[in-house]
Interface confidence: medium
Amino acid sequence: QEGDFPMPFISAKSSPVIPLDGSVKIQCQAIREAYLTQLMIIKNSTYREIGRRLKFWNETDPEFVIDHMDANKAGRYQCQYRIGHYRFRYSDTLELVVTGLYGKPFLSADRGLVLMPGENISLTCSSAHIPFDRFSLAKEGELSLPQHQSGEHPANFSLGPVDLNVSGIYRCYGWYNRSPYLWSFPSNALELVVTDSIHQDYTTQN
């Protein structure tokens, strides 16, 4: 990384948690001095090129499509910029996860799913037949990897004190430390509703 330049960004245009055979679009921030942008996957500390874009004067941020997602395409991605023959800059890294490689865990709650702000709820993710050593809890619609992780089995995720932003549909995934980008099928979904008017009648549609 050169001098005091800010690190260019890399981002997924949709969720980085991708079902087997699904697709995702990756965007590399354009930097003025680069004549070539390459998307690289980092496997075992080795870089492998996934795609490249030559710079055009009218170009916006270069985009790359990863389709037919599978175990080999899951992992850490980085944009590599060629500044000159022997000069490079690199973006931050992006982690892509593939789901559907193991059977699904089961997600349950320790109380009703309609809450008032400030209340607590615990979600439990368990798998009776598959000995996962890690679980992740994901909220539908989020564009980053789930922040909630647990190494317990079953995994308890404490949400709270909750605010209105906690409302949403949650699923959990199981995975193994040795293969952190290969996740299970999603669990059953639980919809949490946080409302400051508990008298409303909440019904959820599938």
Epitope: L20, D70, A71, N72, L101, Y102, G103, L182, F185
Partner: antibody, heavy 116, light 107 residues
């Protein structure tokens, strides 16, 4: 095109063990799990177990003590081993590729007869 | 284990008919059900997963419906190639369990 093909011994003596190989093509075992299912003559289907793409296994608890499933990703082969066979283990044994937690593609099956 | 009760066990129907096969699970399986077809002398083929979704290449005359513990497979305008055995299978829990099968025969 996705294909699975089972190969087994045909005849097994009672109390002996069974080994069946499922050789797959058209997909990678690092991306898809493989189930084993059997069907005794004139009877229904029974799920035996699965080896997931990541390598872990899930078994039918009724058979777990004598069942083992493994694989060799590089050879595109999945292996079923069952110990202490009895006559009621006589069945057609199938392997099937997992898809969305279910069975999408099946092999033709291999008939295993347990008899002295 | 979840018990899958499939009916009827056999039925005689004519070309062009519409038929429905039902499966009842011993508990709510939340659409975690699939349907399989086995043609005479052939292996099995997946038709439907997650209750209603057609596997690739399956004709649209096949459809699945249901919720909770009760599900059905409907075949409209039966064609000669549809005469086969059909099975439901649940994957809400381990072990996976199958219905007893339905044999479709030509009347």
């Amino acid at each position: 095109q996705v294909q699975l093909k089972e190969s087994g011994p045909g005849l097994v003596a009672p109390s002996q063990s069974l080994s069946i190989t499922c050789t797959v093509s058209g997909f990678s075992l690092t991306s898809y799990g493989v189930h084993w299912v059997r069907q005794p003559p004139g009877k229904g289907l029974e799920w035996l177990g699965i080896i997931w793409a990541g390598g872990s296994t899930s078994y039918n608890s009724a058979l777990m003590s004598r069942l083992s499933i493994s694989k060799d990703n590089s050879k595109s082969q999945v292996f079923l081993k069952m110990n202490s066979l009895q006559t009621d283990d006589t069945a057609m044994y199938y392997c099937a590729r997992d898809h969305y937690d279910l069975f999408a593609y099946w092999g033709q099956g291999t008939l295993v007869t347990v008899s002295a | 284990d979840i018990l899958m009760t499939q009916s009827p066990s056999s039925m005689s129907v004519s070309l062009g008919d519409t038929v429905s096969i039902t499966c009842h699970a011993s508990q709510d399986i939340s659409r975690n059900i699939g349907w399989l077809q086995q043609k005479p002398g052939k292996s099995f083929k997946g038709l439907i997963y997650h209750g209603t979704n057609l596997e690739d290449g399956v004709p649209s005359r096949f459809s699945g419906s249901g919720s909770g513990a009760d599900y059905s497979l409907t075949i409209s305008s039966l064609e000669s190639e549809d005469f086969a055995d059909y099975y439901c299978v649940q994957y809400a829990q381990f072990p996976r369990t199958f219905g007893g099968g339905t044999k479709l025969e030509i009347k």
